[in-house]
Interface confidence: low
Amino acid sequence: ACDTATCVTHRLAGLLSRSGGVVKNNFVPTNVGSKAF
């Protein structure tokens, strides 16, 4: 399982996700933030 800061934040913070160019606040973890150092 993903255990890094990126993944923890995605699970807990309710990040916005992309869907067809429309922003939806659906609290689904996304891969948008793949950790950049």
């Epitope: 993903c2 993944c7 891969n31 948008v32 933030g33 950049a36």
Partner: antibody, heavy 122, light 107 residues
């Protein structure tokens, strides 16, 4: 203007200690996760340590190679990051970069400093 | 530790050509992969995150693809300033790891 400026590098003998600093400006430092990443001369990149944001309790993680010898910390009031390096070895010789990261859902922000050189040699 | 293997080690191409760089992970990392460009004497520069998302200000000629264990960075038409070393990294598990780099040189 966003800036990360590392300092504290230099020549140190094996077994010695050094404290690196990274001064941040131009962004909300406390919201960012920060990593130290190093690069030995002529070699590739190696992650060293990470400290999470204030809201993530400033939790820390370390590479096995430095665990127990290096300590990462932050002072959000001073917009500063630190890396305390003890029991230094020749293989710790590298340019040390600090890199900040923030994910705001739609995209991310990622900033790097210019690096500071640490040389461990007798 | 997740090992990232980049290929080729060196890629010799001319401006205007298409560059395809590969990064293979020893374990599945979903899409938690980033790509960086580094020029001599400079800090790395983030190009792609989340396997396929272009970072702020990165030209459209840079694109990333892949998921699971196989990832690709493509530069559709090389500009003179693109010749540099490229690294992939993963942030799926600690420790974060980087590939060994691909040097993109002018033919």
């Amino acid at each position: 203007e966003v800036q990360l400026v590392e300092s504290g590098g230099g020549l140190v003998q094996p077994g010695g200690s050094l404290r690196l600093s990274c001064a941040a400006s131009g962004f909300t430092f406390s919201n960012y996760w920060i990593s130290w990443v190093r690069q030995a001369p002529g070699k590739g990149l190696e992650w060293v340590a990470e400290i999470r944001s204030e809201s993530d309790a400033s939790a820390t993680h370390y590479a096995e190679a430095v665990k127990g010898r290096f300590t990462i910390s932050r002072d959000n009031a001073k917009n500063s990051l630190y890396l305390q390096m003890n029991s230094l070895r020749a293989e710790d010789t590298a340019v040390y970069y600090c890199s900040s990261y923030f994910d705001y859902g739609l995209a991310i922000q990622n900033y790097w400093g210019q690096g500071t050189l640490v040389t461990v040699s007798s | 530790e997740i090992v990232l293997t980049q290929s080729p080690a060196t890629l010799s191409l001319s401006p205007g050509e298409r560059a395809t760089l590969s990064c293979k992970a020893s374990k599945r990392v979903t899409t938690y992969v980033s790509w960086y460009q580094q020029k001599p004497g400079q800090a790395p520069r983030l190009l792609i995150y989340g396997a396929s998302n272009r970072y702020l200000g990165i030209p459209a000629r840079f694109s990333g693809s892949g998921s699971g264990t196989d990832f690709t960075l493509t530069i559709s038409s090389l500009e003179p300033e693109d010749f540099a070393v490229y690294y992939c990294s993963q942030s799926y598990n600690y420790p974060y790891t980087f590939g060994q780099g691909t040097k993109l040189e002018i033919k």
